[in-house]
């Protein structure tokens, strides 16, 4: 299946390194080598020696190289979408009174009907159709964690709108949590940005899928339009065939 | 230079095409294509079909492709960084109360030393070096706006830590502002992340740079460890190259 | 960039991306795709010219070189840079499914 | 993936990364560039058969598509998949210089 | 390695009833669809009908010759795949097969079989 | 229903020989055409699916090809252990359906 051809592997380090000469000199737009009669004797500078430094290591906050795939990703995702539970449900009653956040469960039932077992998840996405916006809005996506208390996830700043648009927070590793925990029902909160001086913290962001009065109330559930989890996942007899397989070539 | 071949285009596109074949099949782990003898007869379902927009669209925050680097990037980039404006400039003075916050501020006549025209600026980061941490913090940055306001940029969870570490924030789109305009000092402010209903939004991460007591009192800088601006950009003379050989090959 | 942008409107000999409609039906005699009926998969192609020589006079080479081998690899080649995923809609038995397949369709390319 | 990782420690025929340290003042003649002495920049090397033939044994061939051709290429060829830059210090006259240059080491490569 | 075994064949009298069964080893059983596909004496192969696999929710499928009289069922539980004959013809006589299905139209594994006979 | 006709009924070959078994269907079945062999007293096997691909652990002296209605099984060198009858089977459209099967004898 392949043309066999011996490789003189001499000559190709001898041409990447030609290639490498070539590939510096370039990127600093050196026709030539810059001339060292100037250089000063002694060390590097320290402040310079610190600067080098900084340069070349990485630091936390930023952004490596991106990994690349594993094999499982090769392999295609099956898509399901799992709707949230309908707003008259009793577990929105405890979250009714607020106007800085808006309150969206999923039944884990339905998600592990999806997708049997967390390591098949390989991504899942709450996606919100916000109706149209006056003013720019600062919101901010958390998680239920335990009784009563949130967690932070993800913000977003909303630029006005006039017309309907579909927003997505990437929510796997949450997803993936509720797949491997026991509980029922699990949730979103979407809020407002609080900053700690203004107080000014109301979500105008209309979302489908809950009136436009006080947001907890009963709501009037827009068909298929209503928060939903999209999610990407590996089927279970692809899974299975994949860990048969974990041979290198 | 290049070995010149005719290329028999249709050649290329039917082993492309027999290459797709294989991929699809492959990915769906098929060995060949599933029979439709038992598909019901009909258009497709609805929720399928919405099942499939909603995977074909691309959605407002969702991460698109990266783009490909343009030319620009190929080519070399002059490192430098500016230190930030010692805690005991006049500016800090109206900032020294906050619990919640520290400031952090630039002398932009520095900013445009390095890199005289916005344009140049390929990456720009704020680093700072934190000290050891006892409990996780959610960190919120903001760029100072106008004359009392300020604009949310990033966050950041910081875990619990018996060491010192570098963080590091991308701040391009925010120096490449500041060089466009004419304001002589511009500033970042570290905040504590304040949720709606939480009170407690005490900074508890220690800066180096700043005194461990009250967060905006005269600091003791400990030498080059304060937070700086580390700057990435095309060297002038090479961008002016740049700009007289945008041709294509 | 080497993208669609840019390919489909020039007459580029070099490396560069190439138009490729694939109709599921007439190219690949399948009907068991019920969407899309096909899709614009493009492929790369055009030579990546080594360029780098001692005897190549040296400032044009400069300009070039970013161009033609970036990568300083000791034989480029040309091949995809962006790439974007491809949902499609089948049934397995009597069960419609929708999945995903990534990396089917070429944005771009770029000399490797 | 055919990183450092795997294709440092393993005799792979087919494409992966080669190791490759580039010693500036022996490989290079160069004595101009003050820091780093040298560095790791390794590179792509092997073939990527195409083993997408009506004639093999279509379910042997499907469990290696995705390493030898997951891009669907015409004719794949074995480039970098993941690279990483090189900060370095030199002088321009009297003034020391710290400057970055991007996609300088490979650290996986692939066939596309 | 696969393996499909068939029993219960036997002589019936017109108008009786019988079940087979098939016993599945070497795969998951509940990700097939499983088969019933017979031969009579001399003759070519003729496929009755099968049973779909858990995502297609265990639904059959019959061919017309079979409808109403044959039911086509499975234990997941002792991987097991049962076909209960009823009114039984003497055209019903030959060898039965279980096979399993794939998605693709085809049978990739058969059972050796199982001979019935409908006499008087 | 769809009908499958395969030709010949039988046939007769010597060892070495190259031989194709025919088979057709009464409408376009879009490369669903499947091929088994049973020899005598034995069970059936699955040879080839899909017009062309050979199942695992079949020798790779079998071979198929064709499109629409028309299909070929070619045995590039006939060897003893090939004497059985080959059936062909549409997989496009319920209800499944065979040929009648082709017989295969060693002169």
């Known amino acids: 299946l392949s043309t066999c051809k011996t490789i003189d592997m001499e000559l190709v380090k001898r041409k990447r390194i030609e290639a490498i000469r070539g590939q510096i000199l370039s990127k600093l737009r050196l026709a030539s080598p810059p001339s060292q009669g100037e250089v000063p004797p002694g060390p590097l500078p320290e402040a310079v020696l610190a600067l080098y430094n900084s340069t070349r290591d990485r630091v936390a906050g930023e952004s490596a190289e991106p990994e690349p795939e594993p094999e499982a990703d090769y392999y295609a995702k099956e898509v399901t979408r799992v709707l949230m539970v309908e707003t008259h449900n009793e577990i929105y009653d405890k979250f009714k009174q607020s106007t800085h956040s808006i309150y969206m469960f999923f039944n884990t039932s339905e998600l592990r009907e999806a997708v049997p077992e967390p390591v098949l998840l390989s991504r899942a996405e709450l996606r919100l159709l916000r109706l149209k916006l006056k003013v720019e809005q600062h919101v901010e996506l958390y998680q239920k964690y335990s009784n009563n208390s949130w967690r932070y996830l993800s913000n977003r700043l909303l630029a006005p709108s006039d017309s309907p648009e579909w927003l997505s927070f990437d929510v796997t590793g949450v997803v993936r949590q509720w797949l491997s925990r026991g509980g029922e029902i699990e949730g979103f909160r979407l809020s407002a940005h609080c900053s700690c001086d203004s107080r000014d913290n109301t979500l105008q962001v209309d979302i489908n899928g809950f009136t436009t009065g006080r947001r907890g109330d009963l709501a009037t559930i827009h068909g298929m339009n209503r928060p939903f989890l999209l999610l990407m996942a590996t089927p279970l007899e692809r899974a299975q065939h994949l860990q048969s397989s974990r041979h290198r070539r | 230079l290049s070995t010149c071949k005719t290329i028999d285009m249709e050649l290329v596109k039917r082993k492309r095409i027999e290459a797709i074949r294989g991929q699809i099949l492959s990915k769906l782990r098929l060995a060949s294509p599933p029979s439709q003898g038992e598909v019901p007869p009909g258009p497709l379902p609805e929720a399928v079909l919405a099942l499939y927009n909603s995977t074909r669209d691309r959605v407002a925050g969702e991460s698109a492709e990266p783009e490909p680097e343009p030319e620009a990037d190929y080519y070399a980039k002059e490192v430098t960084r500016v230190l930030m404006v010692e805690t005991h400039n006049e500016i800090y003075d109206k900032f020294k109360q906050s619990t919640h916050s520290i400031y952090m501020f630039f002398n932009t006549s520095e900013l445009r030393e390095a890199v005289p025209e916005p344009v140049l600026l390929s990456r720009a980061e704020l680093r700072l070096l934190r000290l050891k941490l006892k409990v996780e913090q959610h960190v919120e940055l903001y760029q100072k706006y106008s004359n009392n306001s300020w604009r949310y940029l990033s966050n950041r969870l910081l875990a619990p830590s018996d060491s010192p570490e570098w963080l590091s924030f991308d701040v391009t789109g925010v120096v490449r502002q500041w060089l466009s305009r004419g304001g002589e000092i511009e500033g970042f402010r570290l905040s504590a992340h304040c949720s709606c209903d939480s009170r407690d939004n005490t900074l508890q991460v220690d800066i180096n740079g700043f005194t461990t007591g009250r967060r905006g009192d005269l600091a003791t800088i400990h030498g080059m460890n304060r937070p700086f601006l580390l700057l990435m950009a095309t060297p002038l003379e090479r961008a002016q190259h740049l700009q007289s050989s945008r041709h294509r090959r | 960039a080497l993208d669609t942008n840019y390919c489909f409107s020039s007459t580029e000999k070099n490396c560069c991306v190439r138009q490729l409609y694939i109709d599921f039906r007439k190219d690949l005699g399948w009907k068991w795709i019920h969407e899309p009926k096909g899709y614009h998969a493009n492929f790369c192609l055009g030579p990546c010219p080594y360029i780098w020589s001692l005897d190549t006079q040296y400032s044009k080479v400069l300009a070039l070189y970013n161009q033609h081998n970036p990568g300083a690899s000791a034989a480029p080649c040309c091949v995809p840079q962006a790439l974007e995923p491809l949902p499609i809609v089948y049934y397995v038995g009597r069960k419609p499914k929708v999945e995903q397949l990534s990396n089917m369709i070429v944005r771009s390319c770029k000399c490797s | 993936a055919l990183d450092t990782n795997y294709c440092f420690s393993s005799t792979e025929k087919n494409c992966c990364v080669r190791q490759l340290y580039i010693d500036f003042r022996k490989d290079l003649g160069w004595k101009w560039i003050h820091e780093p002495k040298g560095y790791h920049a390794n590179f792509c090397l092997g073939p990527c058969p195409y083993i997408w033939s009506l004639d093999t044994q279509y379910s042997k061939v499907l469990a290696l598509y995705n390493q030898h051709n997951p891009g669907a290429s015409a004719a794949p060829c074995c480039v970098p998949q993941a690279l990483e830059p090189l900060p370095i210090v030199y002088y321009v006259g009297r003034k020391p210089k710290v400057e970055q240059l991007s996609n300088m080491i490979v650290r996986s490569c692939k066939c596309s | 390695e696969v393996q499909l075994v068939e029993s219960g064949g036997g002589l019936v009298q017109p108008g009786g009833s019988l079940r087979l069964s098939c016993a599945a080893s070497?795969?998951?059983?509940?990700?097939?669809?499983m088969s019933w596909v017979r031969q009579a004496p001399g003759k070519g192969l003729e496929w009755l009908g099968f049973?779909?696999?858990?995502?297609?929710?265990?639904?059959?499928e019959y061919s017309a010759s079979v409808k109403g009289r044959f039911t086509i069922s499975r234990d997941n539980s002792q991987n097991s795949l049962y076909l209960q004959m009823n009114s039984l013809k003497t055209e019903d006589t030959a060898v039965y097969y279980c096979?399993?299905?794939?998605?693709?139209?085809?049978?990739?594994?058969w059972g050796q079989g199982t001979l019935l006979t409908v006499s008087s | 229903d769809i009908q499958m006709t395969q030709s010949p009924s039988s046939l007769s070959a010597s060892v070495g020989d190259r031989l194709t078994i025919s088979c057709r269907a009464s409408?376009?079945?879009?490369?669903?055409l499947n091929w088994y062999q049973q020899k005598p007293g034995k069970t059936v096997k699955l040879l080839i699916y899909?017009?062309?691909r050979l199942h695992s652990g079949v020798p790779s002296r079998f071979s198929g090809s064709g499109s629409g209605t028309d299909y070929t099984l070619t045995i590039s060198s006939l060897q003893p252990e090939d004497v059985a009858t080959y059936f062909c089977?549409?997989?496009?459209?319920?209800?499944?359906?065979f040929g009648q099967g082709t017989k295969l004898e060693i002169k």
């Open positions: 089977q549409q997989g496009d459209t319920l209800p499944w359906t």
């Open positions: 409408q376009d079945i879009s490369n669903y």
């Open positions: 049973i779909r696999n858990k995502p297609n929710g265990y639904t059959t």
């Open positions: 096979a399993r299905y794939t998605g693709g139209g085809y049978f990739d594994y």
């Open positions: 899909y017009t062309s």
């Open positions: 070497g795969f998951t059983f509940t990700d097939y669809y």
